[in-house]
């Protein structure tokens, strides 16, 4: 058993049929010695008396808010949560496996630039009685500071019969140099509590590996005389690291109709303009990627050919 | 310590092309190592990230773009002195700081070159003959060093009398390649910045 936060405790349980469970001793936070009784949740049934209460925690029915009273007055609370371990593996029931970039990916993180700011998100099908707490650091043995905000519900989607909820959090490394060469990864730890179930999820990464620039901005078309060719120009996204001559991007320019199966024109360039062939009912799209370290491509920025 | 926006002579900054080749060569070599040593811990997640130049050179700090010198987190106090001549200095107006940056890059390359050559000598003794260093990568390191053209004492190639542990050598190769790729990215960014200045 360990303390998650004040008056909230996590009991780690090996979860299998007829498991013996874990013996837990609760102590009432009071100077009083006599006349103390214990109850669980909203029940008025007295579980025991005395300053300490010993319980055998085996299942979710044994978890919950234990309260010690004296003469009708509440003295203190202890909330017990369960953390299940099945076949030596901690449970991951609360969050959905996003399976990208690999199986058992529960947290996904992206950064728009090298400033040390990044966003992580996760998915769940659970809609109520759900709380998240996020901590982060650079390295684990001698951790350097990363400050994370509160996790918020950022999107709701319908997937078949289920509703899916996306939560996200923004974090900022306390003293980040955009030009630095990372040797210690960022560690992100998410505590998830659903009703009386506790789970924790972690992700470890270098900012350089989670870079995904914003799409190029200000796409403009200029038809070339006596030609089917069009000059398309654009600018670096505002959120990209500066100077751009140091943090350079490379671009992919594509002309395509509405269907992915349609024919297309595609060209890669390090410049902020390119010449392509425009077709009726097609659109020109441009995306960006770090020129020197191939992490993710940005989303497409598009304009219609016409 | 930073790179002032110097005004090199018009035309291609002499080292930009070589640095692009360097990044390409080390990326290819790393990819080859990951594929060949698939049953060894050779991915970014599996290895320890070590920097053999730590406390010996200060390329990131010495080559910091002027725009980032206002960022407190970028200003590291490490002091290192370097020789200040070199043919990549495309203009007489080039500052002392730029010379410091380029000589730091030269020292990096020299250290990695020694490490890679020592390692290759060990890998050539491996009866499995599983992996060797790409000669092209070694040649590209050499070309960039020649383009930088700094005079400095030659570092003797390390020779080891004990029987090499090939497993350890291959893991060390992965560590070295990952670190060198990151440094090659920095070098490419620096050359691109200098070329644009």
């Amino acid at each position: 058993i360990w303390e998650l936060k004040k008056d909230v405790y996590v009991v780690e349980l090996d979860w299998y049929p007829d498991a013996p469970g874990e013996m837990v001793v609760l102590t009432c936070d009071t100077p009083e010695e006599d006349g103390i009784t214990w109850t669980l949740d909203q029940s008025s049934e007295v579980l025991g008396s005395g300053k300490t209460l010993t319980i055998q925690v085996k299942e979710f029915g044994d978890a919950g808010q234990y309260t010690c009273h004296k003469g009708g007055e509440v003295l203190s609370h202890s909330l017990l949560l369960l953390h299940k371990k099945e076949d030596g593996i901690w449970s991951t029931d609360i969050l959905k496996d996003q399976k990208e970039p690999k199986n058992k990916t529960f947290l996904r993180c992206e950064a728009k630039n090298y400033s040390g700011r990044f966003t992580c998100w996760w998915l769940t099908t659970i809609s109520t009685d759900l709380t998240f707490s996020v901590k982060s650091s650079r390295g684990s043995s001698d951790p350097q500071g990363v400050t994370c905000g509160a996790a918020t519900l950022s999107a709701e989607r319908v997937r078949g019969d289920n509703k899916e909820y996306e939560y996200s959090v923004e974090c900022q490394e306390d003293s980040a140099c955009p030009a630095a060469e990372e040797s210690l990864p960022i560690e992100v730890m998410v505590d998830a509590v659903h009703k009386l179930k506790y789970e924790n999820y972690t992700s470890s990464f270098f900012i350089r590996d989670i870079i995904k620039p914003d799409p190029p901005k200000n796409l403009q078309l200029k038809p070339l005389k006596n030609s089917r060719q069009v000059e398309v120009s654009w600018e670096y996204p505002d959120t990209w690291s500066t100077p751009h001559s140091y943090f350079s991007l490379t671009f992919c320019v594509q002309v395509q109709g509405k269907s992915k199966r349609e024919k297309k024109d595609r060209v890669f360039t390090d410049k902020t303009s390119a010449t392509v062939i425009c077709r009726k009912n097609a659109s020109i799209s441009v995306r960006a990627q770090d020129r020197y370290y191939s992490s993710s491509w940005s989303e497409w920025a598009s304009v219609p050919c016409s | 310590r930073n790179l002032p926006v110097a005004t090199p002579d018009p035309g291609m900054f002499p080292c930009l092309h070589h640095s692009q080749n360097l990044l390409r060569a080390v990326s290819n070599m790393l990819q080859k190592a990951r594929q060949t040593l698939e049953f060894y811990p050779c991915t970014s997640e599996e290895i320890d990230h070590e920097d053999i130049t730590k406390d010996k050179t200060s390329t990131v700090e010495a080559c910091l773009p002027l725009e980032l010198t206002k960022n407190e987190s970028c200003l590291n106090s490490r002091e290192t002195s370097f020789i200040t001549n070199g043919s990549c200095l495309a203009s007489r107006k080039t500052s002392f700081m730029m010379a410091l940056c380029l000589s730091s890059i030269y020292e990096d390359l020299k250290m990695y070159q020694v490490e890679f050559k020592t390692m290759n000598a060990k890998l050539l003794m491996d009866p499995k003959r599983q992996i060797f260093l790409d000669q092209n990568m070694l040649a590209v390191i050499d070309e960039l060093m020649q383009a930088l053209n700094f005079n400095s004492e030659t570092v003797p190639q390390k020779s080891s009398l004990e029987e090499p542990d090939f497993y350890k050598t291959k893991i060390k190769l992965c560590i070295l390649l990952h670190a060198f790729r990151i440094r090659a990215v920095t070098i490419d960014r620096v050359m691109s910045y200098l070329n644009a200045s």
């Epitope: 089917r228 024919k263 024109d265 890669f268 360039t269 390090d270 010449t275 062939i277 077709r279 | -």
Partner: antibody, heavy 118, light 107 residues
């Protein structure tokens, strides 16, 4: 299976014209760009131009501009390349090629030898 | 027009040995570079597109690398059926242009 089948060899007099055909099978004809590339005996490859069979748009290499015409007939899934004012240096194997991507070629015809000789 | 220069023009190789062909562009073409194989009397066959992207059905011994102006086609271990002429082609701008070709011959 996508295939491009070209017309047979031709012998032409200098100053005349030649029209080579390229019939496509497998896949929808208008879903692909169609190019013509030539190869002189023992020489390399030389791109001549492309057509979008969907709308008849064409683009030609400056070297052949004014002498080459590429057309397409959607009803028969056939593309044509006509080269006029032939000279002896136009003796070559003419290849058609296609792709959903405009700028490179993933399926080629077998080639048509055009000999220009007086 | 962008001029593509291949080297060497002839490459004698022992079967089972690796082979590398170089292609240089007269100006930077990013990764807009494709490789073809051509055997006598046959049409070319696409091997690699956009400098390093492999084609399904093409043996994994063929790989491409490079960007900017310098590109390489590598055959890790030459098989008897790989003796042919190889061409690079740029697609950075029209007109599309090819290298002169490199003939890989049996040593």
């Amino acid at each position: 299976q996508v295939q491009l089948v070209q017309s047979g060899a031709e012998v032409k007099k200098p100053g005349s014209s030649v029209k080579v055909s390229c019939k496509a099978s497998g896949g929808t004809f208008s879903d692909y760009y169609l190019h013509w590339v030539r190869q002189a005996p023992g020489q390399g490859l030389e791109w001549m131009g492309w057509i979008d069979p969907e709308n008849g748009d064409t683009e030609y290499a400056p070297k052949f501009q004014g002498r080459v015409t590429i057309t397409a007939d959607e009803s028969t899934s056939t593309a044509y390349m006509e080269l006029s004012s032939l000279r002896s240096e136009d003796t070559a194997v003419y290849l058609c090629a296609r792709n959903k991507e405009l700028r490179y070629f993933d399926v080629w015809g077998q080639g048509t030898l055009v000999t220009v000789s007086s | 027009d962008i001029v593509m220069t291949q080297s060497p023009l002839s490459l004698p190789v022992t079967p089972g040995e690796p082979a590398s062909i170089s292609c240089r562009a007269s100006q930077s073409i990013s990764i807009n570079l494709h490789w073809y194989q051509q055997k006598p009397g046959q049409a070319p066959r696409l091997l690699i597109y956009f400098a390093s992207q492999s084609i399904s059905g093409v043996p994994s011994r063929f790989s491409g690398s490079g960007s900017g102006t310098d590109f390489t086609l590598t055959i890790s271990s030459l098989q008897p059926e790989d003796f042919a002429t190889y061409y690079c082609q740029q697609s950075n701008s029209f007109p599309l242009t090819f290298g002169q070709g490199t003939k890989v011959e049996i040593k």
